[in-house]
């Protein structure tokens, strides 16, 4: 039975050219996290595998950095980066938990950043 819940940064905004941290946190379960996948729509950005470590998609390696923790840092943001991002927690024995973050990249220099999520 899946008892866990995913907390995310929710809806966030950032300035064009800047960077942002995408963060999710799985709580209320003792399941082992075997892998976390970060996806933008159906495009795989990065993977953090418990045994194999971090893998960044070749097409994003210049603009995506692993961490902090199981999170993901997006750099040199463009307006095309606006959209839905998903953290997919593969766990054992629970199964898979998915969290959603919506990022809006603004042209304006007065983009209001959402509160950064901190893992306790």
């Amino acid at each position: 039975m899946m008892t866990g819940t995913i907390e995310t940064t929710g809806n966030i905004s950032a300035e064009k050219g800047g960077s942002i941290i995408l963060q999710c946190h799985l709580s209320s379960t003792t399941a082992q996290v075997t892998q976390v996948n970060w996806e933008q729509q159906d495009q795989l950005l990065a993977i953090c595998n418990a045994d194999l470590g971090w893998h960044i998609s070749p097409s994003f390696k210049d603009r995506v950095a692993p961490g902090p923790g199981l999170g993901l840092t997006l750099q040199s943001l463009t307006v095309n980066d606006t959209g839905e991002y998903f953290c997919i927690y593969h766990t054992y024995p629970d199964g898979t938990y998915t969290g959603r973050i919506f990022l809006e990249v603004l042209e304006s220099s007065v983009a209001e950043h959402g509160a950064r999520f901190q893992i306790p």
Epitope: N37, N49, A50, D51, I56, P58, I88, T91, G95, T96
Partner: antibody
């Protein structure tokens, strides 16, 4: 290229323990996940479990209490132990590699398989 | 566990026919769907991963599509060596689970 070969007894008595070995040739067992999958005659495929080089194991909850997997890097082999077998465990047992690439992005895509070994549970 | 249901369970077709097999997951698996081909007496062969990406060496007459819960495998022009059983499999969640198979027979 990488090839897998299962070996073990074709006949096991009820309540005994089944032990199978998979030998990897043409490549190394390191840095991959390795799985066991079984198929009863005329039926579908059932994943039994996986093991990683480090010894990390993940078992199908339906079989977890009876399954033990191990890996021997020096022999380039991994093995399956299934205890307290019954006639319901009669099947072809396959070993398989779980190919991990950024494109696949997840464990559970079985890109290389052994030819399978038939195991019958009968007294 | 995630249940995978294939349809039809069997079909009859002729060489040159276009064949479509469907696979439905009991919950969304995004695009974490693989397809395999099994010839009687042989091990399954990996055909398609990530719902639509062709494994190296697999003929281009095979194609896959879908996301979420509904997926299809299409063989654009059936060849004699394609008569086999096809299985879908989800790799979204542990344990990985397979469909019950679709047997493609000669008409």
């Amino acid at each position: 290229q990488v090839q897998l070969q299962e070996s073990g007894p074709g006949l096991v008595k009820p309540s005994e323990t089944l032990f199978l070995t998979c030998t990897v040739s043409g490549g190394s067992v390191t840095n991959y996940y390795w799985s066991w999958i079984r198929q009863p005659a005329g039926k579908g495929l059932e994943w039994i479990g996986r093991i990683y080089t480090s010894g990390s194991t993940y078992y199908n909850p339906s079989l977890k209490s009876r399954v033990t997997m191990s890996l021997d890097t020096s022999k380039n082999q991994f093995s399956l132990r299934l205890s307290s077998v019954t006639a319901a465990d009669t099947a072809v047992y396959y070993c398989a590699r779980e190919g991990f690439t950024m494109v696949r992005g997840v464990m559970g895509a079985f890109d290389i398989w052994g030819q399978g070994t038939m195991v019958t549970v009968s007294s | 566990d995630i249940q995978m249901t294939q349809s039809p369970s069997s079909l009859s077709a002729s060489v040159g026919d276009r064949v479509t097999i469907t696979c439905r997951a009991s919950q969304s698996i995004r695009r974490y769907l693989n397809w395999y081909q099994q010839i009687p007496g042989k091990a399954p062969k990996f055909l398609i991963y990530d719902a639509s990406s062709l494994q190296s060496g697999v003929p281009s007459r095979f194609s896959g599509s879908g996301s979420g819960t509904d997926f299809t495998l299409t063989i654009s022009s059936l060849q004699p060596e394609d008569f086999a059983t096809y299985y879908c499999q989800q790799s979204y969640s542990t344990p990985p689970t397979f469909g019950q198979g679709t047997k493609v027979e000669i008409k």
